[in-house]
Interface confidence: low
């Protein structure tokens, strides 16, 4: 509030002109910058008359209050004028002129002092910044305000930004109030339009195309963003998208492979782990179909070694002794060595084997060499009693005490020396490379069991004690037909998939009969020389409970997923896949279909390239390839029979095979008994 009356004499009490609140007339919105309306005299001529009367009555002569009343013709003005008039008189008629002259804003003479009293606009009561004009009135004044000001003395700035009838002053963004005015402005990233009120977004991406470097520029209101694909973050310095190394952030429980734009977690399948549903943590590959893995030490397992003898015995007996072997035998295998006996100097030998499921005997000594196969097929998974006995002029072979072969021989099988018959007997294999000596070559590997053996009529003494100590020589109590993969190893085959007569050039026709014991594992894989896996058939636990998915993959990409099959059952499941460079077909217990999608053609092209080079075929898992080579890396656990391009794969014919894989026997499903 401005103090008025600054021109009053220093020794005089200054009167403050204060408009009582009761007399204040607050302006409407529309009148905000207009004058305060007051009553005033209608005729300006009268004003001039009043000035003349005042000169005559009160300056040329002294006047009393009543005379002054006649000049003003109203009380308010008279009441206002007269005390001030007296002050003027005092100043100029009592020798105070000098003092008055010295005071600030003092009037030079009585005339000017008195004349100034009725002029309400002198000294100026209005706010200098806000008023446009001041009009004198009867003991009052009227300040006319400039636009943007209000109040009796135009002392209040109008805040146009807060005007409810014109929200935000009509500005689209920022309204800045200023004394007596206002102006609109824009936020960063916007420009003002010509109407000085509205703002328009600046498209920084168009203005400066290189603003984000190699990243994608995205204009947003008032700004811009440099966008990177998922798995990348923007580097302000280099103005480029940089791969986020999620692996450095310990995203994965076990193994992590970072790649441009992402990462993949892996679990060590070979140690029995699989990726959990969160795709980060690992969980144990659990058994979905428990198997009866009970073994008995009284049962000798013939396939303990993939290559080599399972048991070696040496006999030194009186020369009258003849060769004799009795045992119970059980197998589903069709070919392999049961036992091989030879003289100390290797000159004479006898082979008891299985070929085509039937007993075969090959013998060679100084007198003869013979081969005979006969009897019924005994690779039926049942216990068959077999006896091979050297008689005086023949060798008699009996199955279930029935003579099935009678092989004539001119002399003793093994020649005694120094009054002793020395014989070495090897179970389930040859002691060395004897293939060239055989009359007819044979695959020596035999997945079978023997029990109740009696060799050279010496009973089982001494042998059981050897076997008892070695768990891996013990045979399963119950087995079924099939091949068993225990989830700890693989078998490797060399198969030529190229078919020169076919237009496709190569084809992979796979038939699988499976009875898995765990819901996750690689069943079949083709592996390239560069440690990639151009094709794999794997099993994974499905998201739906108690079911499994079958994944067909090319390298680490799943090209097809057969969902929610109930494979963990005591019944075998039959699956067929046919792949060539043009298409993929499959047949499962639920459907027979040809798969065709755009991405498949790209993946088949990758497979085609690999198939033109050399690939190794693996069953039951993967060799040492990177974890990221395939979607699944766990070993398959369960029973599985594989037919590729019309050939039933015999694990005995594999290039290599883990000893724990059973080529021709599969543990029975564990049946919950009442007692357990």
């Amino acid at each position: 509030m401005r103090v008025l009356g600054g021109r009053c004499g220093a020794l005089l009490a200054c009167l403050l002109l204060v408009l009582p609140v009761s007399e204040a007339n607050f302006l409407s919105k529309q009148q905000a910058s207009q004058v305060l309306v007051r009553k005033r005299r209608a005729n300006s001529l009268l004003e001039e008359t009043k000035q003349g009367n005042l000169e005559r009555e009160c300056i040329e002569e002294l006047c009393n209050k009543e005379e002054a009343r006649e000049v003003f013709e109203n009380d308010p003005e008279t009441d206002y004028f007269y005390p001030k008039y007296l002050v003027c008189l005092r100043s100029f008629q009592t020798g105070l002129f000098t003092a008055a002259r010295q005071s600030t804003n003092a009037y030079p003479d009585l005339r000017s002092c008195v004349n100034a009293i009725p002029d309400q606009c002198s000294p100026l009561p209005c706010n200098e910044d806000g008023y446009m004009s001041c009009k004198d009135g009867k003991a009052s004044f009227t300040c006319t305000c400039k636009p943007g000001w209000q109040g009796e003395k135009c002392e209040f700035d109008i805040n146009e930004c807060k005007d409810p009838s014109n929200i935000n002053g009509g500005c689209s963004q920022i309204c800045d109030n200023t004394p007596g005015s206002y102006h609109c402005s824009c936020k960063n990233g916007f420009v003002m339009l010509s109407n000085k009120k509205d703002c328009k977004d600046v498209d920084e991406c168009s203005l400066k195309p290189s603003i984000c470097g190699t990243a994608v520029c995205k204009n947003i209101p008032g700004d811009f963003e440099c966008e990177c694909p998922e798995g990348y973050r923007y580097n302000l310095k280099s103005k480029s998208c940089e791969d986020i190394d999620e692996c450095s952030e310990n995203m994965c429980a076990q193994l992590c492979v970072n790649y441009p734009g992402g990462y993949t977690c892996y679990c060590d399948g070979k140690k029995g782990f699989k990726l959990a549903q969160d795709q980060k943590s690992c969980e144990v590959v659990s058994v979905c179909l428990p198997l009866n893995l009970d073994t008995k030490y009284e049962l000798l397992y013939l396939a303990e070694q993939f290559a080599g003898v399972v048991l070696y015995l040496k006999f030194r007996l009186p020369e009258i002794s003849r060769f004799s072997a009795e045992f119970d035998f059980r197998t589903y295998d069709s070919e392999g060595v049961i036992l091989y006996a030879e003289s100390i100097d290797h000159s004479a030998w006898l082979l008891i084997a299985l070929r085509g499921g039937k007993i075969e005997v090959q013998l060679k000594n100084e007198h003869t060499s013979k081969i005979t196969t006969g009897g019924d097929v005994i690779n039926n998974g049942l216990w068959n009693m077999v006896s091979v006995e050297e008689l005086e002029h023949s060798i008699s072979i009996k199955i279930a005490k029935e003579a099935v072969m009678d092989i004539n021989k001119p002399g003793p099988l093994f020649k005694p020396e120094n009054g002793l018959l020395e014989t070495k007997v090897y179970f389930a294999g040859f002691p060395r490379k004897v293939e060239s000596e055989l009359i007819k070559p044979i695959n020596p590997r035999l997945d079978g069991c023997i029990r109740s053996w009696n060799l050279m009529k010496q009973g089982a003494s001494g042998i059981k004690e050897i076997i008892q100590e070695k768990q891996n020589k013990h045979c399963l109590v119950t087995v079924e037909k099939g091949s068993y993969y225990p989830g700890s190893g693989i078998a490797q085959f060399h198969i030529d998939y190229n078919n020169v007569s076919s237009a496709e050039g190569w084809h992979v026709n796979v038939t699988l009969n499976i009875r898995p014991s765990t819901g996750t594992g690689v069943m079949l894989a083709l592996v390239s020389g560069n440690n990639t896996v151009p094709f794999a058939v794997s099993l994974v636990d499905s998201t739906s409970e108690k079911s499994q998915d079958i994944l067909l993959s090319v390298e680490n990409t799943v090209i097809y997923r057969i969902q929610a099959l109930s494979l963990c059952s005591d019944q075998q499941s039959h699956l067929e896949f046919r792949v060539n460079r043009n298409n993929l077909e499959l047949s499962t217990p639920l459907k027979i279909e040809t798969i065709s999608h755009e991405d498949l053609q790209r993946q088949l092209a990758v497979l085609d390239k690999a198939m033109k080079a050399k690939v190794a075929t693996y069953l039951g898992g993967l060799p040492d390839v990177p974890f990221s080579a395939t979607p699944v890396n766990a070993f398959y656990n369960g029973c599985m029979e594989v037919n590729i391009n019309g050939v039933q794969l015999d694990l005995d014919e594999a290039i290599s095979k883990h000893n724990d894989i059973r080529a021709h026997s599969c543990p029975s499903v564990w049946k919950k008994t009442k007692n357990s």
Epitope: S501, N509, T511, N583, E585, S587, P589, I592
Partner: antibody, heavy 115, light 106 residues
Framework: QVHLKESGPGLVAPSQNLSITCTVS????????VSWVRQPPGKGLEWLGM???????DYNSTLKSRLSISKDNSKSQVFLKMNSLQIDDTARYYC?????????WGQGTSVTVSS | QIVLTQSPAIMSASPGEKVTITCSAT?????MHWFQQKPGTSPKLWIF???NLASGVPPRFSGSGSGTSYSLTISRMEAEDAATYYC?????????FGGGTKLEIK
Amino acid sequence: QVHLKESGPGLVAPSQNLSITCTVSGFSLTGYGVSWVRQPPGKGLEWLGMIWGDGTTDYNSTLKSRLSISKDNSKSQVFLKMNSLQIDDTARYYCARDPGAMDYWGQGTSVTVSS
Amino acid sequence: QIVLTQSPAIMSASPGEKVTITCSATSSVTYMHWFQQKPGTSPKLWIFSTSNLASGVPPRFSGSGSGTSYSLTISRMEAEDAATYYCQQRSSYPPTFGGGTKLEIK
């Protein structure tokens, strides 16, 4: 959809040869095998042989010496040829798509061996 | 070759009656397929791989078995089920069919 149709001579004289064509649609002969089966009047079914998608063939051992199966992938046709027909070769001859189980059959063509 | 023997050769059943057709093999087989044939029409794949119903086959049909003994069962006979049913093995070459079982409605 899958469709197979056999076309044959109908009547064949004894000791003469038989040729039947099976024209297929709705699937590719490179991806599926086709089997041939015959059925004498009022009797059961007998599998004759098949040709696989890759062109390899399998024959019933009892007829192997007289039988030949071939195909033309581009024309979607499979051919059965049988030599030296006898009276007991009179039957209805069917072709069937065979992805491990004969899931689609033609309507068959009747062959009568008679002089 | 494996010989498949179907029994019975001919049988009739009343509507709603349970029907079982058996197929016996001379050697063990892995799977058995079944075909339905009605007079004047081609055979149709009815059950494949022992127990899987071909598309369009009513759920009243089921298949089971293992080794040398297999069967096809209709839980409740209906008039439309009257036909000849053949079993077929593919485990050993050549594939062979059973002699067929003619099922009639009473």
